[in-house]
Interface confidence: low
C-alpha cells in the first residue's frame, strides 16, 4: 500500500494550526471499517492519533489533533495539529493498514517571527567622535534561533566586536540580544538585521548618531 506525504517539511507558525498531509489510494469497495490508521511520533513511537474499527479513536497528543473524517474514505489520512508549539517540531509517521500496510513520515518545522528590534545606546549622552559606544539590538519571541547581522550607514557589514546571545522562554521562543561595540565617527548610522532562517523574514532596527541628539528611527 503506497502512502504519500509531502517531501518538504510542513512549516507552521507557533499558535496556529498545521495540517500534516498523508494520503493513500483506496481500492474499489473500500470501507472505513477496514481501515486502521495510526499517527505517531517517528522517534519515540508515541501515539498521536488513531482510527480503527470504523471509529476515530481520538487524540493521544494533548488533545490537539484531529483527522478529517469526511475525507478518510477518499484516502485522505491527514492530521490536523492545533495550536502548534515549539515542542511539536519533529517527524510524524502516518501508518495506514487496510489489507496491505504502508507508512511514511512527514516533518513539522515550527517557526515564529521575531519582533522589530529595539535599539539602545550606552552611554547615550555627551558623545563625541572617537568615543567607544555599545549599541544593543534586542528582538523577541522568535523561533528558531535568529541570524543577526550588523552594518553601517553605507551598508558595510560590521562583524568585529559583536556579541550575540539567544535565550529561550518557557514556550521555547527565543529572545535575541546582540551587542555591537564601535568607535564613533563624526556621525553614523548603525543597523541590525534579525533574520528568521526558516521564514526568511528580516526584522530591522537602526540608530543614527549625529553628535547631539541621537535619533532612533
Amino acid at each position: 500500500l503506497e502512502v504519500q506525504v509531502p517531501e518538504d517539511p510542513v512549516v507552521a507558525l507557533v499558535g496556529t494550526d498545521a495540517t500534516l498531509c498523508c494520503s493513500f489510494s483506496p481500492e474499489p469497495g473500500f470501507s472505513l471499517a477496514q481501515l486502521n490508521l495510526i499517527w505517531q511520533l517517528t522517534d519515540t513511537k508515541q501515539l498521536v492519533h488513531s482510527f480503527a474499527e470504523g471509529q476515530d479513536q481520538g487524540s493521544a497528543y494533548a488533545n490537539r489533533t484531529a483527522l478529517f473524517p469526511d475525507l478518510l474514505a477518499q484516502g485522505n489520512a491527514s492530521l490536523r495539529l492545533q495550536r502548534v508549539r515549539v515542542a511539536d517540531e519533529g517527524s510524524f509517521t502516518c501508518f495506514v493498514s487496510i489489507r496491505d500496510f504502508g507508512s511514511a513520515a512527514v516533518s513539522l518545522q515550527v517557526a515564529a517571527p521575531y519582533s522589530k528590534p529595539s535599539m539602545t545606546l550606552e552611554p547615550n549622552k555627551d558623545l563625541r567622535p572617537g568615543d567607544t559606544v555599545t549599541i544593543t539590538c534586542s528582538s523577541y519571541r522568535g523561533y528558531p534561533e535568529a541570524e543577526v547581522f550588523w552594518q553601517d550607514g553605507q551598508g558595510v557589514p560590521l562583524t568585529g566586536n559583536v556579541t550575540t546571545s539567544q535565550m529561550a522562554n518557557e514556550q521555547g521562543l527565543f529572545d535575541v540580544h546582540s551587542v555591537l561595540r564601535v568607535v564613533l565617527g563624526a556621525n553614523g548610522t548603525y543597523s541590525c538585521l534579525v533574520r528568521n532562517p526558516v521564514l526568511q523574514q528580516d526584522a530591522h532596527g537602526s540608530v543614527t548618531i549625529t553628535g547631539q541628539p541621537m535619533t532612533f528611527p
Epitope: L41, E89, G172
Partner: antibody, heavy 120, light 108 residues
Amino acid sequence: DVQLVESGGGVVRPGESLTLSCAASGFTINSYAVSWVRQAPGEGLEWVSGISGSGVRYYADSVKGRFTISRDDSNNTLYLQMNSLRAEDTAVYYCARSNKVTWNNFFDYWGLGTLVTVSS
Amino acid sequence: EVVLTQSPGTLTLSPGERATLSCRASRSILTSLAWYQQKPGQAPRLLIYNTVTRATGIPARFSGSGSGTEFTLTINSLQSEDFAVYYCQQYYDWPPLTFGGGTKVEIK
C-alpha cells in the same frame, strides 16, 4: 556506546557558586535533548533543567534565575552553572539524555551522578 | 504542574511474588508516562515508556498499563535483582517534567 560522565561536584557554602560538567560520548550532544536531574539524600528525583538539541533552555521554578544550563558542542559537554547555592540544593546531580531532540520526553541514558553539598 | 502520587510507599514481598505499583496523576497525562528503576548508589534505569512500551533489554516480567490519571507497573515473579525503588515520570505537560515520590520494593 552512549555514556554520560558528570564531574564538578563538591562541598560549598551557602551563597557560593559551582559549575557541573557532563561529558557525553557515543552521540552528538546537539542532536539530542539533555537534562539535569537531582536527588537529595534519601529523597526522590527532581528535574532541574534541560536544553534541547537546538539550544532551547528550560528551568524548574526552584532554580530559575540561579542556575544556567549550557553546552559546548565542540567538546560534546553539558554544563550547569549554579549560583547563590542553598542548603536545599544539596543532592546528587545526574545528567540524563532524552531520546528526542525536543526534550518533553523520558530519559533513556543517565550518568552516574556527582554529589553537591551546600553546608556552612 | 502535574503532580504524580505513587503508592504504596513501600511494598514488602518475597521472590516469585507479583508486585503491583500505582502512579496517580493530578490531571490527565494520556499515555505520556515512564517508569524507572533505581538501586542504591546507582543511577535510575528506564524500564517503560509511553505507559506500556518496554525499553531495550527490559525483561518481559515488567509491564505497564493505564491511561489518563491512573497507571500501574506490574512485576511478575519478582527476582532478587528487582528489589529497588521505582519512579514514575510524566512528559505530557511540561515544563516541568515531574516524577512521582517513588515506591520501594523490598524483600520480605
